[in-house]
Interface confidence: medium
Amino acid sequence: AWELTILHTNDVHSRLEQTSEDSSKCVNASRCMGGVARLFTKVQQIRRAEPNVLLLDAGDQYQGTIWFTVYKGAEVAHFMNALRYDAMALGNHEFDNGVEGLIEPLLKEAKFPILSANIKAKGPLASQISGLYLPYKVLPVGDEVVGIVGYTSKETPFLSNPGTNLVFEDEITALQPEVDKLKTLNVNKIIALGHSGFEMDKLIAQKVRGVDVVVGGHSNTFLYTGNPPSKEVPAGKYPFIVTSDDGRKVPVVQAYAFGKYLGYLKIEFDERGNVISSHGNPILLNSSIPEDPSIKADINKWRIKLDNYSTQELGKTIVYLDGSSQSCRFRECNMGNLICDAMINNNLRHTDEMFWNHVSMCILNGGGIRSPIDERNNGTITWENLAAVLPFGGTFDLVQLKGSTLKKAFEHSVHRYGQSTGEFLQVGGIHVVYDLSRKPGDRVVKLDVLCTKCRVPSYDPLKMDEVYKVILPNFLANGGDGFQMIKDELLRHDSGDQDINVVSTYISKMKVIYPAVEGRIKFSTGSH
């Protein structure tokens, strides 16, 4: 028997520095977790203790903090090189700055193979990107061979900016021939490493003949065997065992997100490459693990540029940006309109001639808007200003909801109106009218939504049975502020870009902004 240790991360999302327990900015260092310096300490400790170790990343290193905003992926290549990752799969967020924003900072600079078998380049891009990412890589580990085959969510064109010269194929269809090719090369230990979410990971384990282990990402799935060490609730045991169609037991793993845990899986193979046993658990990277001083020093060196960036002007406002609680928790506020407009603008994807865009709607809990911005400071807007407005380090995500769920959400928005509670929704691509004289749960008297399958966008009444795409904060997608109906009834959820980054990019693009209060939210006469 031959034993392999797989160390794995996924959905790190730019958390190069240690974070608080909820993966936001570290405040009390003695209670902070994760970060590349701490990860390196643990990885090296395991490399020293065990003979056959692979360090793998299942995608979405890009996007999530000011680190990515400023360094645009150069930080990912630099620190993944320093940690000596063995391979990485492309995630959807790796395309957030377009293909060029992937090629230059990461693909050309990484000293480890970057993989995806189901992304096919065409046209002029094919020669430009040739060899910079691979469908698979055979790695020497000790005296054995391990094949790593990559995959990426086929939804990426709707979630990011891969352009028109990359085709995202069905994962299973694309993986099978690559695995077959590895078998012909006498590679009998094969890991599928990819970024399509836990459901697809399980399908790959079930359907792709010859895959021995699946290491996934995208769905931020936390798996654990035994008593979990922090706040995350396990979605199943680690590893999650899938019985393949040809009767093999295939371990499937994921390691939550944000670099909070290091996935640790031990696999035992027989001489024919069959998995005999698999066991392990994610390792919580808490403060009991010291940060490596060399990596930490490097982090501090790179940090200097971030501090300078946060005070630079992104753009100007010529109007007061009203992000006050008195406004945003009670009525339409222009800060809410600005943020929602930025959220929609960030999700412009012309992927189908029948649609002007794939999504037109935004909802945003008023309680998530934490500060106004005064235009009387020469109109200047900085990252620092926006961090005061959106201090929680969340993301603006894409969900699919039925009209009936949206109606419930808007009823919840005003079910206890008047108490300055955070659930009052700011909107984009939606016209809502409330009648507060009616009883809670029946206060939405009009709800019109902007069409997407149209050449000239216009507002149509919401249809209860239709499925709609909506951009919203991850906080709402996870049922925050009492929006349990969203969490329980959403049909699809894909995590998006860092909230501040979305707004800052929009402001930089517009240069001068002047959002108005324009009648997106109305109250029927006599009720307000």
Epitope: F40, Q44, R47, R48, N81, A82, R84, Y85, D86, A87, A110, K111, F112, P113, K137, V138, L139, P140, G142, D143, V145, L185, N186, D292, S294, I295, D298
Partner: antibody
Amino acid sequence: QVQLVQSGAEVKKPGASVKLSCKASGYTFTSYDINWVRQATGQGLEWIGWIYPRDGFTKYNEKFKGRATLTVDTSISTAYMELSSLRSEDTAVYYCARKEGYRGDWYFDVWGQGTTVTVSS
Amino acid sequence: DIQMTQSPSSLSASVGDRVTITCRASGNVHNYLAWYQQKPGKAPKLLLYNAKTLASGVPSRFSGSGSGTDYTLTISSLQPEDFATYYCQHFWSTPWTFGGGTELEIK
């Protein structure tokens, strides 16, 4: 430009130890492995081991384990190789070489000029 | 340990000749193979890696091929500066061994 500069020639007696240095410049020292390779006169090349300067992680050729010790001083971007219990067959030119990549593309892309070690009684 | 056997051990050729040097590994090294050129009194110089990728600044007359256990270095048209000793090296399982070398001399 990127270069590795090695210390001068050494003459040692059998049983003694020798410590060779390799000073790097023109690149980030902590980002690349430093390997050591030797070549006896008129002979081929023999790999001794490598060290990752960022944290001193080492890997040795079993043949040299226990006799060769690889270390670094990152403050002066210098790698060292100490070889103990010298015998006459250790007489050779010793090279340090930078290794590119990790498990991606592997090769020695930059070499030092070599240090001649002579072991003689 | 994987042994690397180079052939021939020495070779005489003329300027303009096409020359082929082979390297056989005792086990599959999966293209993790580099070729170096060494001149007397000098350190080796990288020519190719991954069996066939030309290193930066190396003339295109040098090329590599092969897979599994058998690899070849070809010089399409010998130039005066190409007379030297050539070594292959595998980067599979440690120790990373070198071939015995091929001395290329002027005929």
